[in-house]
């Protein structure tokens, strides 16, 4: 393994994870790990000086920049919170607020909005899709024979109650937000008026 | 010690428009969000908007995004709320604040305000 | 967006009194929540944080708490410095201030 600064002819660096190619001295120079920056650049006989990233500042990764990136606040304006603070070698983590969730572009969350969700009324339900969303939800009515009494989300259409596999005779008719109501039979040989 | 400084009044006349400024020292403005909020006289406290003074991002509440604009100044650690097109509605005390990496929820530091009066 | 209401909107208490000013966020804010003290011809002081935590330099008379929609600023033995008005601040998805408080000395 060559210790830096090093010649090389093809400019492609041993280790290029942690050393960069230098085209002024043509040598192949140590980059600076996390949570550090380069103090003084390589030259042909001394290898790259580095210093500590500044009070609220980071370089998260190995780099041979000559300044650290500003720590941000996590911005409460777009619904983010911090979950860990900004470090010499890590930007804070920002997460979204309970009842809020990402907004994605590029694969970054680069905000968060509240999730809205939509409640079908009683007689409805949601439509099934094959997507699983929570937002634009569809509502639709149940079906005949079927029925849904709460204002929820997810809630399915139920069958109505068939009294006579009971045993019972029907005493309300369902609707699509109510179930059937059944009751005992008459007692056989009692008089119907 | 974190500290804002505005300036005590300005006037201005209806149709035209002013610059607010908000020096801030012992911190770094590229650390922080500078937000602006408006006092009309004997009334509440209601949130305008703040920038990002490290991109120059900002956002505003749907009342103020034709009247404010912010900007900012790294080099001088320096943020600003031009209003325009005055009316004499716009007559408040305009305050600037920092979320900062220590508050980034609060608003611990404020600057002492600045009467704008909007008169002809 | 979500509201923030604050009652009374006037009140007037003796020294050594024990106060209670309510705001009410018009949909849950999961303890996101500040209060700030305002005196005449001064900019706004921040007093609690996060419902509950003081900030520093604020006397211990004051204490926050609340969760929900529901939240309570106590001053618990009032004090002559204490007449101002008193603001509370949601910072669940962005920043809003509610009406106000004024509080005076009997």
């Known amino acids: 393994q060559l210790v830096p600064p090093y010649r090389i002819e093809n400019q492609t660096c041993w280790d290029q994870d942690k050393e960069y190619y230098e085209p002024m001295h043509d040598v192949c120079c140590s980059r600076c790990p996390p949570g550090e920056f380069v103090f003084a650049v390589c030259s042909r006989s001394q290898d790259t000086v580095c210093k500590t990233c500044p009070h609220n500042s980071y370089n998260e990764h190995w780099n041979h920049l000559s300044t650290c990136q500003l720590c941000r606040p996590c911005d409460i304006v777009l619904g983010f919170e911090e979950v860990a603070p900004c470090t010499s070698d890590r930007k804070a983590e920002c997460r979204c607020q309970p009842g809020m969730s990402c907004v994605y572009l590029d694969n970054e969350c680069v905000h968060c909005e509240e999730e809205r969700l939509v409640l079908c009324q009683p007689g409805t339900e949601a439509e099934v899709t094959d997507e699983i969303m929570d937002t634009d939800v569809n509502c639709v009515p149940c079906k005949p024979g079927h029925f849904q009494n709460t204002s929820s989300p997810r809630a399915r259409c139920q069958p109505h109650t068939r009294c006579e596999i009971q045993g019972l005779v029907e005493a309300a008719p369902g609707t699509s937000y109510s179930d059937t109501i059944c009751k005992n039979p008459p007692e056989p040989g009692a008089m119907l008026l | 010690e974190v500290q804002l400084q505005q300036y005590g009044a300005e006037l201005g006349k209806p149709g035209t428009s002013v610059k607010l400024s908000c020096k801030v020292s012992g911190y770094n403005i590229g650390n922080t969000y500078i937000h602006w909020v408006i006092q009309r006289p004997g009334k509440g406290l209601e949130w305008i908007g703040r920038?990002?003074?490290?991109?120059?991002?900002?956002i505003c509440t749907e009342k103020f995004k034709n009247k404010a604009t912010l900007t900012a100044d790294l080099s001088s650690n320096t943020a600003y709320m031009q209003l325009s097109q005055l009316k004499s509605d716009d007559t408040a005390i305009y305050f600037c604040?920092?979320?900062?990496?220590?508050?980034?929820?609060?608003?611990?530091?404020w600057g002492q305000g600045t009467l704008v009066t909007v008169s002809s | 967006d979500i509201q923030m209401t604050q009652s009374p909107s006037q009140l007037s208490a003796s020294v050594g009194d024990r106060v209670t000013l309510s705001c009410k966020a018009s949909?849950?804010?999961?303890?996101?929540l500040n209060w700030y003290q305002q005196k005449l011809g001064e900019a706004p002081r921040l007093l609690i944080y996060?419902?509950?935590i003081l900030q520093t330099g604020i006397p211990s008379r004051f204490s926050g708490s609340g969760s929900g929609t529901d939240y309570t600023l106590t001053i618990s033995s009032l004090q002559p410095e204490d007449a101002a008005t008193y603001f509370c601040q949601k910072y669940y998805s962005g920043f809003t201030f509610g009406s106000g408080t004024k509080l005076e000395m009997k």
């Open positions: 604040a920092p979320t900062t990496l220590t508050t980034p929820d609060s608003f611990a530091y």
């Open positions: 949909q849950n804010i999961y303890k996101y």
């Open positions: 996060s419902t509950n």
């Open positions: 920038i990002d003074p490290t991109n120059g991002n900002t």
